[in-house]
């Protein structure tokens, strides 16, 4: 090896060099000095470095590793935020125009109901909205909530409208009477089942997004140990001290070093791998009965199908209310009333199946392929560092932390630095507690995302087949796949314009509101804008 | 006539356990989310539990989570708060309240004339 | 969770007006939750006078009103009768569902 070059006989470069980084000369000595008190660029001759020096190294090099790790993580970070914000608030859209499809439906089909039903409906969606951004609301209480509240309006309004004032106080009677007698038929379960199964798969996306941004945000923001700091000192700065200031460090020693800086970090790759592959597994299966979307736009469908139900049955219905509730006053008000075989729908209720076109669906599988782009994130940093900062090309005339060498030797390397710092001893350590905490959570999300992960092929579970609908029935190239009254299935050609209609807000009165009867053929309203054909929720 | 009508209250050591119940009548109770508010002498109101329609989401204020239990059996029409290690800064008349609505919080339409528990050696 | 930040008194004569104010935070009232406003007259349990911010139960007079924006909400009392001397709490829930009150008006008509 070559002895290594005369240092600069008055530390002149260096000088200037460390100027930069503390302005002010006290600390660097004007000519080279033996250098006893140095504890990490330890000299093999004079040495153009102060003790003061070597800490201001130290501080520098953790500093220059924190921002190196942040621009390594911008590209993924704004990836991962920018997609969480969109898809919140594209949910939310969705949300207000499921509202709004629904308001619209009781507006044009059944106008006496209104404005109790706007207030019913307004106080579910807000539920919705809420369970989406992770309030602890249960899903059938919420659908229970939404029909106990709209019998008692559809009973003394559409089915009993003579009723005199005074007979208002059967409310109470009515709620009770429209779980006990079943009055909407199946259809409340089947909303449960819909929304309760989109609705966590949404939440779980949505949490899953998030957790990538804290992801990011802990491993962005990590502060390395001093043991770190010096090893990155000697590999940046050390040979400054002998006065080498055009030298670069071997690529191959800065990659022995950055394993060493981010073995804690690294650690995270494993579940990180799994986190991406898990919410791609969340996102294939999220169609049908699990795309939020595609459930909730169709739900006005389903809501107009059960009152039509409950119509349907009114003869029925009113004479065992009138029965049930004549003297309400005396009535115990609890479930405890199931007449034989009342009403039981076996009707063929096939689920919603939506259009997509640029919808949320295909925005949701564009993010995914992007982030596989990143599935080696984490076991790729070390390298990714080495290639951003400044490293010899091919690993000659180079810096190994001790001295200039043609050809770097991790073996030599690490001999060199036996006495000076243990490499080995820093990778088993194990990764920080902020680390190791996210790792929990990861681990977490990881698990939840599997247990979510729909099975290929299946719309309905089994437990609805009991219950007397069919499951299955919607093939991929049906249109015609909402609701089921028979009088003309309602097809939804979604096609919510993603980003710009995520400027758009919508009230109920810019819902279709053309009050006259439509056959289905006539349900095609180029309406909403930029929604494109969006079928009208007429009858 | 819609009631509301709270048992259970009284004189009990720190520490201790204490169950109050309260009996609902006039309505359908299973439709409704239920609440026990608390209110020390001469303090302002202080929720304290809630339960949904069905019994499937509770919820609980800071000072009282891991040591009180909401529940509902709406065969019986009647909500419970079970009190567990008991403390003085618990002393209060905790009312028993109806939701207007079923799902979770929102107004409570409908109170008791409530229990007076107090904690104290 | 942190209560709502009321007034702790307020007073008026008869036929005067009384208006009190309830302020929470973005994620309480100024989230897409409802304000409601309770009556209470000592050793008494509390009334629903106002839910969904704005709407009275029946039975409850007009002259109790209720309206929100933003972060607060406030309770108006027009036309102010002995009657309505009491202790009045404003309430909403956080994102979490809890349920949040405020540390009670007491109301004085003079």
């Known amino acids: 090896q070559p002895p290594p070059p005369p240092p600069d006989a008055t530390c002149h470069q260096v000088r200037s060099f460390f100027q930069r980084l503390q302005p002010g000369l006290k600390w660097v000595p004007e000519t080279p000095v033996p250098g006893s008190d140095l504890q990490v660029c330890l000299p093999k001759g004079p040495t153009c470095c102060s003790r003061k020096m070597e800490e201001k190294y130290q501080l520098t090099a953790r500093l220059n590793m924190e921002q190196l790790l942040q621009s390594a993580s911008m590209e993924l970070k704004f990836l991962i935020i920018q997609n969480a914000a969109v898809f919140q608030e594209a949910f939310e859209i969705v949300v207000r125009h499921a509202k709004n499809y629904t308001n619209a439906m009781f507006k044009n089909n059944y106008p006496s109901l209104t404005p109790q039903a706007f207030e019913f409906v307004g106080e579910f969606f807000t539920d919705v909205s809420l369970y989406i951004l992770g309030s602890d609301i249960n899903v059938d209480d919420m659908v229970n909530e939404l029909f106990d509240s709209l019998f008692p309006v559809i009973y003394t309004q559409l089915m009993n409208p003579g009723l005199p004032d005074s007979a208002l106080d059967i409310n109470e009677c009515l709620r009770g009477a429209r779980r006990d007698l079943k009055v909407f038929g199946n259809f409340p379960k089947l909303i449960m089942t819909q929304v309760s199964k989109s609705l966590q798969v949404t939440r779980i996306f949505l949490q899953a997004l998030n957790l990538g941004i804290e992801v990011i945000n802990t491993t962005d923001h990590l502060k390395f140990s001093k043991d770190c700091g010096r090893m990155l000192t000697r590999m940046w700065y050390c040979s400054y001290c002998q006065g080498l200031m055009m030298v670069k460090p071997c690529g191959g020693y800065c990659n022995v070093v950055m394993q060493g800086c981010m073995a804690g970090v690294v650690e995270i790759d494993k579940y990180w791998r799994e986190y991406i592959l898990s919410l791609e597994e969340l996102v294939n299966g999220m169609y049908r009965i699990y795309d939020m979307e595609n459930v909730l736009l169709g739900l006005f469908s389903t809501i107009h199908d059960s009152i039509q139900y409950v119509q349907k049955n009114a003869g029925k219905l009113t004479t065992t209310i009138g029965k049930l509730c004549a003297h309400s006053q005396q009535r115990q008000y609890r479930s405890a009333y199931y007449p034989e075989d009342l009403f039981i729908d076996k009707k063929v209720l096939k689920v919603a199946h939506v259009e997509h076109e640029e919808t949320l669906s295909s925005r949701r599988r564009e993010l995914i392929q992007k982030l596989k782009s990143f599935i080696s994130f984490y076991s790729a940093l070390p390298g990714y560092i080495c290639s951003h900062s400044p490293v010899a090309e091919n690993d000659t005339l180079c810096w190994n932390g001790q001295e200039l060498v043609e050809r770097y030797s991790q073996k030599a390397a690490r001999n060199g630095m036996k006495n000076q710092f243990n490499l080995h001893e820093l990778k088993m350590k194990g990764p920080e507690p902020v680390v190791s905490q996210i790792i929990d959570k990861l681990k977490h999300i990881n698990q939840l995302l599997r247990t979510m992960s729909m099975p290929k092929g299946r719309v309905l579970d089994k437990n609805l087949d009991e219950e007397g609908f069919e499951s299955g029935d919607c093939g991929d190239d049906e249109d015609e796949c909402i609701g089921g009254s028979g009088d003309g299935m309602i097809k939804v050609k979604n096609q919510l314009r993603f980003l710009a209609e995520l400027a758009y807000d919508l009230d109920v009165d810019d819902a279709p509101g053309n009050s006259q009867q439509a056959t289905p053929k006539d349900n095609e309203i180029s309406t909403f804008h930029n929604l494109g054909n969006v079928h009208s929720p007429l009858k | 006539q819609v009631q509301l009508q709270e048992s259970g209250g009284g004189l009990v050591q720190p520490g201790r356990s204490l169950r109050l119940s309260c009996a609902a009548s006039g309505f359908t109770f299973s439709s409704y989310a239920m609440h026990w508010v608390r209110q020390a002498p001469g303090k302002g109101l202080e929720w304290v539990s809630a339960?949904?329609?069905?019994?499937?989401?509770?919820y609980y204020a800071d000072s009282v989570k891991g040591r009180f239990t909401i529940s509902r059996d709406n065969s019986k029409n009647t909500l419970y708060l079970q009190m567990n290690s008991l403390r003085a800064e618990d002393t209060a008349v905790y009312y028993c309240a109806k939701d207007r609505r079923g799902s979770h919080a929102d107004a409570f339409d409908v109170w008791g004339q409530g229990t007076l528990v107090t904690v104290s050696s | 969770q942190s209560a709502l930040t009321q007034p702790p008194s307020a007073s008026g004569s008869p036929g005067q007006s009384v208006t009190i104010s309830c302020t929470g935070t973005?994620?309480?009232?100024?989230?897409?939750?409802?304000v409601s406003w309770y009556q209470q007259y000592p050793g008494k349990a509390p009334k629903l006078l106002i839910y969904?911010?704005?709407s009275r139960p029946s039975g409850v007079p007009d002259r109790f009103s209720g309206s929100k924006s933003g972060t607060s909400a406030s309770l108006a009392i027009t036309g102010l009768q002995a009657e309505d001397g009491a202790d009045y709490y404003c309430?909403?829930?956080?994102?979490?569902?809890?349920?949040?009150f405020g540390g009670g008006t007491k109301v004085t008509v003079l």
């Open positions: 969904k911010s704005s």
């Open positions: 973005s994620s309480d009232v100024g989230l897409m939750h409802n």
């Open positions: 309430q909403s829930y956080d994102s979490s569902l809890r349920v949040v």
């Open positions: 339960i949904s329609s069905s019994g499937g989401s509770t």
